[in-house]
Interface confidence: low
């Protein structure tokens, strides 16, 4: 997605992104909570195709691991955390039945505050 | 996705997320910048899938649509903006070729920051 | 309090054709896959079909002394279960229990009280 | 289709009494997929086992699982007057299917 230091922004929380095949995803988690096996490959009208998905995370070696970047620390406590969202992936539940399921994969570094209390 | 509210927290950023369906997206932009129309239904073995995505965007009715929340001012500008994320659909291409390509949908709400120049 | 119901239980001749229902309350009913099982008269339980939640689409499976014959169905709005039974015979009579599926594996933790099918002539 | 025989078919057995009740599988069962219930008359069966020894919920202690393979076991080590009803194992590791219950009833 478009880059914010090519415009002289900052993000408050630096991220890395990655492509992920289902080779090395393995397992994910579904809309309902269950872990569920994600299928290698796809069938498609001319073959196969191998499935895998964009992912966002924050990045663990970046400057904002210790907390978020620009935040006025005398009100506020920050984190920067990975939040998930919901793509559509062939896959296979622990009932060993095949289907199309929206599982959850890394989509973001978001920035989360906790108000300082009163020393 | 997990909930910072629960915890006591609050985001840098207000977003809403919704199902949208392709109906509603009609096009999309593909990893190559063009313009590619999502297909409503999706062949599956035992008929067709409707098409949908899970995005989340920058709320505009939002407390922090004027800048993001918790930011020392001080020292920096800041902006709400809704990033995007690649998602595999099946889509027609201008010459009508249907085929999976990767888009790109909005799926998060992150702050970028300027730095605050001298007075 | 988890609570399933069924009803559309009747006599009927081989041939016909009858519909079950099974109305869900106090649970999420449309993350849950569900089932169907079975009690003949006097004998033990066997599982006739199942359909998948929302996690997936809802995908249907069948025992093989039932499949094409019977059809199983959701309607989240309604929080209702439904069990289409064709071409009925003597040996479908049972008492029809409507089942929640454990999120995991095909297992059962809560039940509804069941409605009686007799295959008659 | 895995076959599920269980023994006795019914156990005669007086209040306070230990009862053992036998789930035998026709193959190996993997992990350990199977569950237990209990039917009393014009009721529905109830939960009380699953993944072989874990105990659903409300479920009091003196119900017991355990075994593996193809040999399992439902323990109730102290027979209350509630539980003198039809209990039935089931597998989950396939299709599912249920063994054809053991009656415990009072002696």
């Known amino acids: 997605h478009s880059d914010p230091a090519r415009r002289g922004e900052l993000s408050v929380c630096d991220s890395i992104s990655e492509w992920v095949t289902a080779a090395d995803k393995k397992t994910a988690v579904d809309m309902s909570g269950g872990t569920v096996t994600v299928l290698e490959k796809v069938p498609v009208s001319k073959g196969q195709l191998k499935q895998y998905f964009y992912e966002t995370k924050c990045n663990p070696m970046g400057y904002t691991k210790e907390g978020c970047r620009g935040i006025d620390k005398r009100h506020w406590n920050s984190q920067c955390r990975t939040t998930q969202s919901y793509v559509r992936a062939l896959t296979m539940d622990s009932k060993k039945r095949i289907g199309w399921r929206f599982i959850r994969i890394d989509t973001s570094c978001v920035c989360t505050l906790t108000i300082k209390r009163g020393r | 996705h997990s909930d910072p509210a629960r915890r006591g927290e609050l985001s840098v950023c207000d977003s809403i997320s919704e199902w949208v369906t392709a109906a509603d997206k009609k096009t999309a932009v593909d990893m190559s910048g063009g313009t590619v129309t999502v297909l409503e239904k999706v062949p599956v073995s035992k008929g067709q899938l409707k098409q949908y995505f899970y995005e989340t965007k920058c709320n505009p009715m939002g407390y922090t649509k004027e800048g993001c929340r918790g930011i020392d001012k001080r020292h920096w500008n800041s902006q709400c903006r809704t990033t995007q994320s690649y998602v595999r659909a099946l889509t027609m291409d201008s010459k009508k070729r249907i085929g999976w390509r990767f888009i790109r949908i909005d799926t998060s709400c992150v702050c970028t920051l300027t730095i605050k120049r001298g007075r | 309090d988890v609570q399933l119901v069924e009803s559309g239980g009747s006599v009927v001749r081989p041939g016909e054709s009858l519909r079950l229902s099974c109305a869900a309350s106090?649970?999420?009913?449309?993350?849950?896959?569900m089932s169907w099982v079975r009690q003949a008269p006097g004998e033990g339980l066997e599982w006739v079909s199942g359909?998948?939640?929302?996690?997936?689409?809802?995908?249907?499976y069948y025992a093989d002394s039932v499949k094409d014959r019977f059809t199983v169905s959701r309607d989240n709005s309604k929080n209702t279960l439904y069990l289409q039974m064709n071409s009925l015979r003597a040996e479908d009579t049972a008492v029809y229990y409507c089942?929640?599926?454990?999120?995991?594996?095909?297992?059962?933790?809560?039940w509804g009280l069941g409605t009686l099918v007799t295959v008659s002539s | 289709e895995i076959v599920l025989t269980q023994s006795p078919g019914t156990l005669g057995l007086s209040p306070g009494e230990r009862a053992t009740l036998s789930c035998r599988a026709s193959?190996?069962?993997?992990?350990?997929?199977l569950a237990w219930y209990q039917q009393k008359p014009g009721q529905a069966p109830r939960l009380l086992i699953y993944?072989?020894?874990t105990r659903a919920a409300g479920i009091p202690a003196r119900f017991s699982g355990s075994g593996s393979g193809t040999e399992f076991t439902l323990t109730i080590s102290s027979l209350q007057s509630e539980d003198f009803a039809v209990y039935y194992c089931?597998?989950?590791?396939?299709?599912?299917?249920f063994g054809g219950g053991t009656k415990v009833e009072i002696k």
């Open positions: 359909i998948r939640g929302s996690g997936g689409d809802a995908v249907t």
């Open positions: 993944d072989t020894s």
């Open positions: 193959r190996s069962i993997g992990r350990t997929y």
């Open positions: 106090g649970f999420t009913f449309s993350i849950y896959d």
């Open positions: 089931q597998q989950y590791d396939d299709w599912p299917s």
């Open positions: 089942a929640k599926e454990n999120n995991r594996r095909i297992f059962f933790d809560y």
